[in-house]
């Protein structure tokens, strides 16, 4: 069936339409476009005989119609009166006549709307705004948009007009928005430019910022007010009632006591014609003097006097707090507070007490901090070290002594040799050493303050010889796979080779042995049993060379998991059971038997003399090892046959 | 794009032939009729006639009855202007034209143009 | 056959300027009144159709108007690309005729 598509039906003014004709008849004569929905001579748009190429327009054309081949009809620059139907009138080759009609509508291209508000200055809680989408134009859907979102679902929203006009009853200052109208017809959408809804209301009561009310004398008040409201506020300020001034900042410089009070902001809207005040109570406290720390010792001694530390000057109900090394006081028996906090004992001073101290007065408002003070404790001479810790020293070379001691004040120093003085000084030297110069070098330190003296003696060899070294281990039973060992090749030398072997071999390259300290220590990581072995290090220099007796490492491991002998399992009746358990472990373990699950004795052999089929069960022996505190098991099943059968066959 | 293409420029002396080609492309040939334009420089443009493309059907106007003669070769998309026993007054430039739409009272697609020079 | 007329064969003009080129007809031609350009190098153009349809693609500076006998084409600003010669046709009864042309020259 002859049929007309128009593309698209629903067209835009100045835009084009295609009649599509679907179906078209073949041996055509010719065809004919109408405008309207019948064929009349007088309203004929084109006409076409079929081969000439020639179309022929009729009274109907307007110079905007462009016919094709295939019948189709195109309408450029559509206007209104295009809207309506069209009739292809077609002739046939055997002249039988045949139609179809199509139809389009012709919309305007909608202008760009604007929004007219019956109210351009609401109150909030009390006007209605009427908000009206410009111009009012025929076949056109308007919409409404707020914030660019839909029109949300509220009691107080209300559409009319065919949806033209929005109402905003009894408006709040949430509804100052951004405003938008659409308009819509079936060719085009636009929207309006947005309009800001401006409700007028507040103010609401007023915030007082800062919050705080406490000051001390001396300080600047610096008060602001802030209410919310549209247009902003007015704002005054009254002080105990009296009006001060028109600002919305109240700054008094410099305040006593006597600038306490009632601070009341006043918040003044002219458009809504609305005050709201809030009160806030200021108190000024008189300024604490600075707090100072005074000590009942200046120099006291380590470990013999206490120090009494008290905060000055002492005021009637105040806070005292204190402060060391900028932490609050820690928890310790040696530390003591007065009943009101003001004096600080410490009791039997160390050298760590030197601080620093603060004391805090506390008021109202703020802590005020002392200076801090820092004590000075008499300590020491602890025991001197003397460096370096060579005991072995060549001919020929020169001998430099260093000796140091904690002290508090610096001690003074004194070098002795077998018994004799030498020198006061903290440094000894002598050069060109010979083997005269070995003996016993004493280095005295001494504290002038608190009396003490404390010695260190050092055998100082001189030898072209090496002596026999020995051996050291932090470590005598280490544990497998756990511990590490470190030895260290006694004594330390000057100019000193240092080497080892393991069973007389060197050593052999492994990531778990390690050589420091310039090859004076060997340290084995993780240690198995098989570095239980012997181990000797050795010294040279170029004179001479020595080597250390062996050390055996004595490693503790195990115990493994045990075996049970006779490996058979299956037994006759009246036979003996005599089993043995063993497993490898240092030191030996200790063994324990269960059968079927019952402790049995702590032997390493079971013996059951004359077994039944009742000895049958599992046999389980546990191992146990002291010293690595590991233990391990085995189970074992045994099965009795009765005699005269054969194990694995039955009667 | 449609275009028509036209041959190139003719040097005949009077009483030869001239046969002037005319390729369509960028829409179907068939579809649309082809006409002819004549251009002498001092006389202006004048219409020859047209051919039915799809016909073959020529039509002459009246001062081009005789010694023209329209053709087609609708495999090369292609029309010809033939002038038989030239005169010096078919000194001229011819153009080929289409209205490349059923509607053929203008023309939307003209080609370049060929001249043709007669001259003993 | 119908006769065309261009009255004026020639005319000079600033570039920027409006300009009106005016056609005839010895009769009534119902609109069917067609303009082109023709460009120095000999190119043809159709700028509008049925008396004020513009082509495609022709720039909204040229426009038509007219009726029954009488017709005119105006550029509504001259530009340098302008410069041609302007034919009108009629289309309303075979054989189509042409005007002698107009050409627009720059002053």
């Known amino acids: 069936k002859l049929t007309i598509e128009s593309t698209p039906f629903n067209v835009a003014e100045g835009k084009e339409v295609l009649l599509l004709v679907h179906n078209l008849p073949q041996h055509l004569f010719g065809y004919s476009w109408y405008k309207g929905e019948r064929v009349d001579g007088n309203r004929q748009i084109i006409g076409y005989v079929i081969g000439t190429q020639q179309a022929t327009p009729g009274p109907a054309y307007s110079g905007r119609e462009i016919i094709y081949p295939n019948a189709s009809l195109l309408i450029q620059n559509i206007i209104q009166n295009d809207t309506g139907f069209y009739t292809l009138h077609v002739i046939k080759s055997d002249l039988v006549n045949e139609e179809a009609t199509g139809q389009f509508r012709v919309y305007p291209e909608l202008p760009k709307p604007s929004i007219s508000s019956n109210n351009s200055k609401p109150v909030e809680d009390k006007d209605a705004v009427a908000f009206t989408c410009e111009p009012e134009t025929q076949d056109a859907t308007y919409l409404w948009w707020v914030n660019n979102q839909s029109l949300p679902v509220s009691p107080r929203l209300q559409l009319s007009n065919g949806n033209r006009t929005l109402t905003l009853f009894n408006v709040t200052r949430n509804d100052t928005a951004s405003y938008k109208c659409e308009t819509q017809n079936p060719v085009s959408a636009r929207r309006s430019d947005s309009v800001i809804l401006n409700v007028l209301y507040g103010p609401d009561a007023p915030t007082i910022s800062p919050l705080n009310t406490s000051y001390r004398s001396g300080e600047n008040l610096n008060l602001s007010c802030h209410a919310a409201s549209n247009p902003p506020a007015q704002y005054s300020w009254f002080v105990n009632g009296t009006f001060q001034q028109s600002t919305q900042e109240l700054f008094i410089p410099n305040i006593t006591v006597n600038n306490s009070g009632s601070y009341t902001c006043q918040a003044h809207n002219s458009d809504t014609g609305l005050n709201r005040t809030t009160v806030t109570t200021i108190t000024v406290y008189a300024e604490p003097p600075k707090p100072f720390i005074t000590s009942n010792n200046s120099n006291p001694v380590e470990d013999e006097d206490a120090v009494a530390l008290t905060c000055e000057p002492e005021i009637q109900n105040t806070t005292y707090l204190w402060w060391v090394n900028n932490q609050s006081l820690p928890v310790s028996p040696r530390l003591q507070l007065s009943n009101d906090n003001r004096t600080l004992t410490l009791l039997s001073v160390t050298r760590n007490d030197v601080g620093p101290y603060e004391c805090g007065i506390q008021n109202e408002l703020s802590v005020d901090h002392s200076d801090p003070v820092i004590l000075n404790v008499l300590y020491g001479p602890d025991d001197p070290t003397i460096s370096p810790s060579y005991t072995y020293y060549r001919p020929g070379v020169n001998l430099s002594l260093s000796c140091h001691a904690a002290s508090n004040p610096p001690a003074q120093y004194s070098w002795l040799i077998d018994g004799n003085i030498q020198q006061h000084t903290q440094e000894l030297f002598i050069s060109n050493i010979t083997e005269k110069n070995s003996g016993l070098y004493t280095c005295q330190a001494n504290n002038s303050a608190s009396g003490h003296s404390r010695t260190t003696v050092k055998t100082i060899t001189v030898s072209a010889e090496l002596p026999k070294p020995s051996i050291s281990s932090n470590n005598s039973k280490p544990v497998e796979d756990k511990d590490a060992v470190a030895f260290t090749c006694e004594p330390e030398a000057q100019n000193t080779t240092y080497l080892w072997w393991v069973n007389g071999q060197s050593l052999p390259v492994s990531p778990r042995l390690q050589l420091s300290n310039g090859n004076r220590t060997l340290t084995l990581f993780n240690v198995t049993r098989n570095d239980a072995r012997a181990y000797v290090c050795g010294i040279q220099n170029s004179v001479s060379a020595n080597r250390s007796d062996p050390v055996t490492l004595d490693v503790l491991y195990g115990p493994d998991t045990p075996i049970i002998s006779p490996p058979d399992s299956s037994y006759l009746s009246g036979a003996n059971l005599n089993l043995s358990c063993h497993s490898a472990s240092n030191p030996s373990p200790q063994y324990s038997w269960r059968i079927n699950g019952i402790p049995q004795q702590h032997t390493q052999v079971l013996f059951i003399a004359k077994i039944t089929p009742n000895n049958n069960g599992t046999y389980a022996c546990f191992v146990s090892n002291l010293a690595t505190g590991r233990n391990n098991s085995i189970v074992k099943s045994i099965t009795v046959s009765a005699s005269g059968t054969s194990p694995g066959l039955s009667a | 794009q449609i275009q028509l293409v036209q041959s190139g420029p003719e040097l005949k002396k009077p009483g030869e032939t001239v046969k002037i080609s005319c390729k369509a492309s960028?829409?179907?040939?068939?579809?649309?009729?082809l006409h002819w334009v004549k251009q002498v420089p001092v006389k202006g443009l004048k219409w020859m006639g047209w051919i039915n493309t799809e016909t073959g059907e020529p039509t002459y106007a009246d001062d081009f009855k005789g010694r023209f003669a329209f053709s087609l070769d609708t495999s090369a998309s292609s029309a010809y202007l033939q002038i038989h026993n030239l005169k010096n007054e078919d000194t001229a430039t011819y153009f080929c034209?289409?209205?490349?739409?059923?509607?053929?009272?203008?023309?939307?697609?003209w080609g370049a143009g060929t001249t043709v020079t007669v001259s003993a | 056959d119908i006769q065309m007329t261009q009255t004026t064969s020639s005319l000079s003009a600033s570039l920027g300027d409006r300009v009106t080129i005016s056609c005839r007809a010895s009769q009534d031609i119902s609109h069917f009144l067609n303009w082109y350009q023709q460009k120095p190098d000999g190119t043809v153009e159709l700028l509008i159709y049925y008396t004020s349809r513009l082509l495609s693609g022709v720039p909204s500076r040229f426009s038509g108007s007219g009726s029954g006998t009488d017709y005119s084409l105006t550029i509504a600003n001259l530009e340098q690309e302008d410069i041609a010669t302007y034919f009108c046709?009629?289309?309303?009864?075979?054989?189509?005729?042409f005007g002698g042309g107009t050409k627009v020259e720059i002053k």
């Open positions: 960028g829409y179907t040939f068939t579809d649309y009729s």
């Open positions: 034209a289409s209205p490349v739409s059923l509607l053929f009272y203008y023309f939307t697609v």
């Open positions: 046709q009629q289309g309303k009864t075979l054989p189509w005729t």
